[in-house]
Interface confidence: low
Amino acid sequence: LPAQVAFTPYAPEPGSTCRLREYYDQTAQMCCSKCSPGQHAKVFCTKTSDTVCDSCEDSTYTQLWNWVPECLSCGSRCSSDQVETQACTREQNRICTCRPGWYCALSKQEGCRLCAPLRKCRPGFGVARPGTETSDVVCKPCAPGTFSNTTSSTDICRPHQICNVVAIPGNASMDAVCTSTSPTRSMAPGAVHLPQPVSTRSQHTQPTPEPSTAPSTSFLLPMGPSPPAEGSTGD
């Protein structure tokens, strides 16, 4: 004869566990039904009656089979620096991710708790490592023969143009300026265009502050972002 199927609630055999989507209630000492995602336990089971489940109220959810007495509250609305990538429903929490130009400085189980603007490398510094969803931009000083004249979270250091005759030598934050009409190479996009001809490689002067190339300090709630590292700007 096939084994009789036990209906919840039932006392489990000694040493055995409750079945899938059931839980052992310590008080009743019975295996009882879990509530499905989108529901919660309104009344816990007894020896003679099974769990009574109820739908989650608005702005609350349960994602798993459960026996929690209250549904979880959905996270607060996404802030202005975030995008809602998953809406709050009875079965899932709202997920907020950082909008473009920002990264997640403090993550939570799903989505981001605190977004921060990507560091912008100031003139004389270029992007050594671009920002990602979870890491900040790393800036580095422009090496001799290269420059960056922008405050940007994406611009790298670019080579100086090569002049026949140098009017003004280039440095870390400025391209070389040539004296006559055309340089020997086409200029990098975004370089300041002054018509001039070509000369020797321009002299390069390093920027005085030596920046940290480490990512910015981790952000801790409830404080705001830590000051940006040298070679970067906060906005």
Partner: antibody
Framework: EVQLVESGGGLVQPGGSLRLSCAAS????????VSWVRQAPGKGLEWIGA???????YYSNWAKSRFTISRDNSKNTLYLQMNSLRAEDTAVYYC??????????????????WGPGTLVTVSS | DIQLTQSPSFLSASVGDRVTITCQVS??????LSWYQQKPGKAPKLLIY???TLASGVPSRFSGSGSGTEFTLTISSLQPEDFATYYC????????????FGGGTKVEIK
Amino acid sequence: EVQLVESGGGLVQPGGSLRLSCAASGFSLSSSAVSWVRQAPGKGLEWIGAIGSGGTSYYSNWAKSRFTISRDNSKNTLYLQMNSLRAEDTAVYYCARDPNSSDYPYGAYGMGLWGPGTLVTVSS
Amino acid sequence: DIQLTQSPSFLSASVGDRVTITCQVSQSISSYLSWYQQKPGKAPKLLIYYASTLASGVPSRFSGSGSGTEFTLTISSLQPEDFATYYCQQGYITSNVGNAFGGGTKVEIK
């Protein structure tokens, strides 16, 4: 400033009653899960119970019969009603809140905000 | 009742030592375990929640691990300000709870 402040402690005779208050400022109690925790002199922490953001109360086994947790949203205040007090109820009583109000209603993610505590002495 | 058993209950250590405290739970609580530090006359301070997540402003020398029934708090290099009492706390089970906290571990200077 986000804070919790307990009040209402003091000397009470055995068998007497006392109601402690926990006033919240800087956030709304109605959207928070807040616990009452006590600590007898020289002893460890003891969880009394909690009230969830939906208003459901939870109690430890020993507290169910004599302690009641309630909340007045209009005053942004949490209460602990203690009846039939005994000498062993002498302790510092704390209220404590989950670090974020959007999670399980009973300290699943710890209690990140605590009041300074109020001392209750039960003695004749 | 669900029981949280901390060990050791007392620990004598020196500055710079690596310290490990364990918390054993009588039934599975997934990862819903927190750790607190308490100094005499002060309210407890949350160190770690969800077993391994460092609370705001807590130094990185503190770390937590474990899930189910076995959990550990580790202080990688004990500092003078770390001498205190440490408690674990479960936040998963609400029915039939004796105490949500462990009995505590007092860390004293050797």
